[in-house]
Interface confidence: low
């Protein structure tokens, strides 16, 4: 019986109308000839949010998204016709849905779209400096988008562009069946996962990709992909989905005789996010929806936040799980999953593991191999047949930090902000849902810093009509949250301290780490501020200790007003 299992009522529940009236949301309600504002790229330096949509790419001013520029990038009529002749929907499928938007260099972005079932990529010039105010498509230079963007707009691409090379997890064919993790662009030959081998990838849906250093040596850098896929036969009885984390060495150039132009360092592990059920059977949240990496002082060890939903149609639930990279690495250094034939169960591999251990990056840190092309044949053979790890990655504390079950919505997106408060640092989660609401949740330690309690601070409706939130970005510089959906883009501040009322007790009871009582109002808390009287208690939300008598009277109002 977990405290975080309680479907706690939000301290503030704001309708779209209330959000508008209190000037707490700015919305861009989309263009008549566009939709699907799903692909976000935040550029804090230029103070822009780039958004890929149907036939358009937008550049929004982070201060106010009402101020924007747009690029129109449709498909040719012939492409549209060809798509239509293939039996596709002219409005929902036969257009250029932007799926990849990445910073290419100091002056350009790289963008890819579905191109009406004929993926296409190009470069977008954004200039050197924000004041250049450049935002234009290089329409003289288009590239084949196969292996970069899916053909089908219903599918996602997880992409990452580093050092001029694009890593992408996507479907590489018209039918949306040949899913792979690719590395394209750059000077090297494109590399991909093994084709038509369900042990590697089994009908995956890619979520995101991240570069995480392994050591102080950049040669050891790895790219991690987060995705969900069908569980492989024998791994589970019946059809099931598993959430996965996959790893690839940045300096993987494929094999020499075998796995030529294929990854030699690809490994994957299952991500577990579950709660024990009353009957002793765990309830699994397997449908990974989104991932957010919270950077720590050590770039090698960000905290991974994952948003999951259940696969079951009968029991609808959502959860947030946290993972540590040290636990992930431990699993990748553990036993490989092995089976002797299609009808056998998966077991931990007990035999001799070849040297250097498959999944290790060729570098001076871990062994004397300069390139994956130099790896011994037995390493490559083993890597090809053992892409999966036997042990799963369990979340921190072996359980979700938040679950929601008896509600009419499911979680879809997450971003997290680390906030300095009077009594320590707190992670504030902003969780998007499939009904167009955003939950603002703070993790508060109970007895120990490991045992967290979730406080649902706010539930905000950010779009006029219920719509799935499909993209979210957080600007720490602007202290704003940006939200994307099929309908448009919304912007809201991370904090609305004044909305918590006019008394110290109300402010204190809110337990919002962004806010504190400054003696006369509930306002933004700055840890550097020298104000002597800053009443705030996130951990306990105890106004008796932190507020004067006058403020405490407001406590009853607060209680009465919100419950």
């Amino acid at each position: 019986n977990y405290a975080n299992g309680k479907n706690n009522v939000p301290r503030l529940k704001l309708s779209y109308k209330e959000m508008l009236e209190s000037n707490n949301v700015i919305t861009f309600n989309g263009l008549a000839n566009s939709s699907s504002y799903h692909t976000f790229l935040l550029d804090e330096e230029r103070s822009r949010l780039y958004v890929g949509a149907k036939d358009h790419i937008f550049s929004f001013n982070l201060v106010n998204i009402k101020d924007f520029q747009k690029i129109v990038w449709p498909v040719s009529y012939t492409r549209r016709d060809e798509c239509k002749w293939a039996g596709k929907d002219i409005l929902k499928e036969c257009a250029n849905f932007i799926k990849v938007l990445e910073a290419y260099n100091q002056t350009h972005l790289y963008a890819c779209g579905t191109g009406a079932f004929h993926p296409i990529c190009t470069y977008i010039e954004v200039g050197h400096h924000p004041e250049d105010n450049i935002f234009k498509l290089q329409d003289s230079h288009f590239e084949n988008g196969r292996g970069k963007s899916p053909y089908d707009p219903k599918l996602l691409t997880a992409s990452l562009l580093i050092d001029g090379e694009l890593y992408s997890g996507t479907a590489a064919d018209f039918m949306g069946r040949d899913f792979a993790i690719f590395r394209t662009l750059g000077h090297h030959h494109p590399i991909r996962t093994e084709q038509h081998d369900s042990r590697w990838l089994n009908d995956p849906r890619f979520i995101s990709a991240h570069l995480i250093p392994e050591s102080d040596n950049p040669e050891d850098d790895k790219v991690y992909f987060f995705f969900r896929e069908n569980a492989i036969d024998g791994e589970h009885s019946g059809k099931a989905t598993h959430a996965r984390i996959g790893q690839i060495c940045k300096n993987d150039f494929g094999g020499h005789r075998s796995l030529v132009n294929k990854w030699t360092t690809f490994l994957k592990a299952r991500l577990i996010c579950s709660v024990p059920g009353p009957n002793g059977i765990d309830t699994h949240f397997d449908e990974l929806q989104d991932v957010f990496l919270m950077n720590s002082k050590d770039p090698k060890n960000p905290i991974v936040y994952g948003v999951f939903t259940t696969s079951s149609n009968i029991f609808k639930g959502s959860a947030v799980c946290m993972y540590s990279m040290s636990d992930v690495r431990r699993v990748f250094l553990g036993p490989y999953a092995h089976r002797d034939g299609p009808n056998y169960q998966w077991v931990p591999y007990q035999g001799r593991v070849p040297y250097p251990r498959p999944g290790t990056c060729p570098s001076k840190t871990f062994g004397g191999f300069d390139s994956t092309k130099d790896l011994p044949d037995d390493v490559i053979t083993f890597a090809r047949s053992h892409p999966a790890m036997y042990n799963p990655v369990f979340p921190i504390n072996n359980r979700p930090i938040m679950i929601k079950t008896d509600v009419n919505y499911q979680f879809t997106q997450i971003v997290v902000d680390r906030v300095d408060a009077e009594d320590g640092q707190y992670d504030v989660m902003f969780i998007g849902t499939d009904v167009g609401t955003v939950l603002k949740v703070v993790s508060v330690p109970k007895e120990t810093w490991h045992d967290l309690e979730e406080i649902l601070l706010e539930e905000m409706t950010v779009f006029r009509e219920p719509t799935t939130i499909s993209a979210m970005e957080l600007s720490t510089k602007q202290q704003q949250l940006y939200i994307g959906s099929t309908a448009g883009v919304a912007q809201l501040p991370l904090h609305r301290c004044d909305i918590y009322g006019k008394a110290c007790a109300e402010c204190c009871l809110a337990r919002d780490p962004y806010c504190a009582w400054d003696g006369s109002s509930c306002s933004r808390y700055f840890p550097t501020a020298k104000a002597r009287t800053r009443a705030q208690d996130i951990r306990n939300g105890d106004p008796l200790t932190h507020c004067s008598d006058g403020g405490i009277e407001g406590r009853m109002d607060h209680h009465h007003h919100h419950h």
Epitope: R79, D81, E82, W85, A86, G87, N144, D173, F174, M175
Partner: antibody, heavy 116, light 111 residues
Framework: EVQLLESGGGLVQTGGSLRLSCAAS????????MSWVRQAPGKGLEWVSW????????YYADSVKGRFTISRDNSKNTLYLQMNSLRAEDTAVYYC?????????WGQGTLVTVSS | QSVLTQPPSASGTPGQRVTISCSGS????????VSWYQQLPGTAPKLLIY???HRPSGVPDRFSGSKSGTSASLAISGLRSEDEADYYC???????????FGGGTKLTVLG
């Protein structure tokens, strides 16, 4: 290894019918669109018809529209071409080809001769 | 009359570089990927180049494809006797709603 094996060709009278089959192996047949391409003796290639992986859409060259019908049985990994109202100009080697944005694999072909 | 136009023949000596052209219109080559097929005497065609310039695995890098506007070309360097074959270009034609081929080019390796 991808293999496509055509059968069903032969000699037929003008106005007659034939049904060509193409047995596929070495790939997931149900994942791919398939096509028929023909080549008249001593002439070039001519695309005849193609069918979506799930039979959802079918397309024909103008020269065969209304006379030929393409179909597939994914459970049997087989592609078919039903040819009715055959004409002398339909005489050709008929190739079955796997479609993947282009014809990436071809069968060895089956000869159809239409005599008057 | 083929929708895509190719020279009926081409020739070269071993070791030479030969180029075969293929011209079309905006409804085929201009807006769609071009493929090249090789047909050795008495055999079925084989895919040589796809998506304008990409080689399937197993095709030697002596074969290369390129495209500019509504024309495409296939280049064969270091010509060998086993390259003697018919070569066809092909592309989807959006206005015809079908796949179109060139008339084919017979390549002869002299000497």
């Amino acid at each position: 290894e991808v293999q496509l094996l055509e059968s069903g060709g032969g000699l037929v009278q003008t106005g007659g019918s034939l049904r060509l089959s193409c047995a596929a192996s070495g790939f997931t047949f149900s994942d791919y669109a398939m096509s028929w391409v023909r080549q008249a003796p001593g002439k070039g290639l001519e695309w005849v018809s193609w069918i979506y992986y799930d039979s959802g859409s079918k397309y024909y060259a103008d020269s065969v529209k209304g006379r030929f019908t393409i179909s597939r049985d994914n459970s049997k990994n087989t592609l078919y071409l039903q040819m009715n109202s055959l004409r002398a100009e339909d005489t050709a080697v008929y190739y079955c080809a796997k479609l993947n944005g282009d014809f990436d694999y071809w069968g060895q072909g089956t000869l159809v001769t239409v005599s008057s | 009359q083929s929708v895509l136009t190719q020279p009926p023949s081409a020739s070269g000596t071993p070791g030479q570089r030969v180029t075969i052209s293929c011209s079309g219109s905006s409804s085929n080559i201009g807006n769609n990927d071009v493929s090249w097929y090789q047909q050795l005497p008495g055999t079925a065609p084989k895919l040589l180049i796809y998506a304008d310039s990409h080689r399937p695995s197993g095709v030697p890098d002596r074969f290369s494809g390129s495209k500019s506007g509504t024309s495409a070309s296939l280049a064969i360097s270091g010509l060998r006797s086993e390259d003697e074959a018919d070569y066809y270009c092909g592309a989807w034609d959006s206005s015809l709603s079908g796949y179109v081929f060139g008339g084919g080019t017979k390549l002869t390796v002299l000497g």
